[in-house]
């Protein structure tokens, strides 16, 4: 009887990666393309329909468009190999390969997709009133993760974690965790994104810096005061110039010089 086999019935792949799932079928001598039929489906979605030596892309489900292909060269090695690129979380499920070549048979293959919380972005800010530090870690992944905060001496600290849906893909989770703590410069803290499953932890290291930039609320005060101080400086400079030289030309030179130097200071202030 015509029988197809699978070397693996479970494939685990990372979000955004590529996967090639294989079903093997018997080929004696050379493959007769016109006698071969290959179907790949996932639940009710048609992915590949290969008949008379060609794929019919008209029947392919739109979610697999430009991402799924049958590796035709592999057919001559007795393999119906489905390659999926840029794997999405929605691709997870049970796939079925059906091959007709004289006889017919089918096999099921499970695809699991995971997304590690690998790119952890971090931020450290300080409250100017209480001098308390706020440490923040944020990352996207799947499935849900809890965030564990620890200090360099391995103390577990209690942070606050919020989970929302990602803007990138609906099934992806956006996990943000904050830790408020009194800390000193060069002290080290760790945020660990812990998912269910073995070896699924991702950790970021946060080092308290020597000096921290002024929080946004403080910068607002400077933005309000800035123009006033600038104006005051210009008035004082003009008065000084007029008193010292008593000539309009000197006033213009002095003001220009002062205004330019002020501009440079503003730029430097904005950059820091």
């Amino acid at each position: 009887a015509f029988t197809i086999t699978v070397s693996k019935d479970l494939y685990v792949v990372e979000y955004g990666g590529n996967v090639t799932m294989e079903c093997k079928f018997p080929v004696e001598k050379q493959l007769n393309l016109f006698a071969l039929i290959v179907y790949w489906e996932m639940e009710d979605k048609k992915i590949i329909q290969f008949v008379n030596g060609k794929e019919d892309l008209k029947v392919q489900h739109s979610s697999y468009s430009q991402r799924a292909q049958l590796l035709k060269d592999q057919l001559f090695l007795g393999k119906a190999a489905l390659q999926i690129t840029d794997v999405r979380l929605q691709d997870a499920g049970v796939y079925c390969c059906l091959i007709g070549y004289g006889g017919a048979d089918y096999k099921r293959i499970t695809l699991k997709v995971h997304a590690p919380y690998r790119n952890i972005s971090q931020r450290i800010s300080v409250d100017p009133v209480t001098s308390e530090h706020e440490l923040m870690c944020q990352a996207e992944g799947y499935p849900e993760a809890e965030v564990i905060w620890t200090s360099s001496d391995h103390r577990v600290l209690s942070g606050k974690t919020t989970i929302t849906n990602s803007n990138r893909e609906e099934k992806l989770f956006n996990v943000t965790s904050t830790l408020n703590i009194n800390a000193t410069a060069n002290e080290i803290f760790y945020c660990t994104f812990q998912r269910s499953g073995p070896e699924e932890n991702n950790t970021a290291e946060l080092v308290i810096p020597e000096r921290l930039p002024v929080p946004a609320s403080e910068r607002t005060h400077f933005m309000i005061l800035g123009p006033f101080l600038l104006l005051l400086g210009v008035v004082l400079a003009v008065t000084f110039c007029l008193k010292k030289h008593g000539r309009m030309m000197d006033v213009e030179k002095c003001c220009t010089r002062d205004r330019n130097s002020k501009k440079r200071n503003d730029i430097q202030f904005e950059e820091t």
């Epitope: 393309l33 030596g53 060609k54 892309l57 008209k58 590796l71 060269d73 592999q74 001559f76 090695l77």
Partner: antibody, heavy 117, light 112 residues
């Protein structure tokens, strides 16, 4: 740009073997099929077979099975065709031709094989 | 194997006028996916063949739009709207539906 550079002309004795090469450049060698085509003097084109460098998979026209053997060297982006048990009928120009699954688009300049005692 | 048939010679044409070259296949090259797997190649004297048309009606890169192709599943025609001196050579049709790939015998374009 895509280029297929074939080896020079060959003059060989009947019963001998010959290996013709086709060096590819300007594209990813392992992503396309390399076809071989025979053209006898003053005659049409005859497809010998192809090899897919990525996997080494081959397909031969039944008429050339046992006569032609297709191989590749991925490290040098070169495809080879070994022709064995040569007779005067094998005297021809042999072309390599790059293709995807459906379309052959770039040809080598051809290698002239003369079988004569 | 799919057999491709062509006339050895075309009707002689005058430069600047149109020319037609025919090709027939022993089985339909129209696939259920709606694509017809026929290619046209031109081999100029002393040169390698070059691709003109693929999938029956698609013009290959760099080929002037004077060339066009049409047909049913088994009968095909290559048209050259304004023949130029550089168009002389042998025109081959080829099927890429089945394996082995097969070529027609070639049609020589003759100029009056």
């Amino acid at each position: 740009q895509v280029q297929l550079q074939q080896s020079g002309p060959e003059l060989v004795k009947p019963g001998a073997s010959v290996k013709i090469s086709c060096k590819a450049s300007g594209y990813t060698f392992t992503d396309y099929y390399m076809n071989w085509v025979k053209q006898r003097p003053g005659q049409g084109l005859e497809w010998i077979g192809w090899i897919f460098p990525g996997s080494g998979a081959t397909y031969y026209n039944e008429r050339f099975m046992g006569k032609a053997t297709l191989t590749v060297d991925k490290s040098s982006n070169t495809a080879y065709m070994l022709f064995s048990s040569l007779t005067s009928e094998d005297s021809a120009v042999y072309f390599c031709l790059r293709s995807d699954w459906d379309v052959g688009d770039f040809w080598g300049q051809g290698t002239t094989l003369t079988v004569s005692s | 194997d799919i057999v491709m048939t062509q006339a050895a010679f075309s009707n002689p044409v005058t430069l600047g006028t149109s020319a037609s070259i025919s090709c027939r296949s022993s089985r339909s090259l129209l696939h259920t996916n709606g694509i017809t797997y026929l290619s046209w190649f031109l081999q100029k004297p002393g040169q390698s063949p070059q691709l003109l048309i693929y999938q029956m009606s698609n013009l290959a890169s760099g080929v002037p739009d004077r060339f066009s192709s049409s047909g049913s599943g088994t009968d095909f025609t290559l048209r050259i709207s304004r023949v130029e001196a550089e168009d002389v050579g042998i025109y081959y049709c080829a099927q890429t539906l089945g394996l082995p790939r097969t070529f027609g015998g070639g049609t020589k374009l003759e100029i009056k």
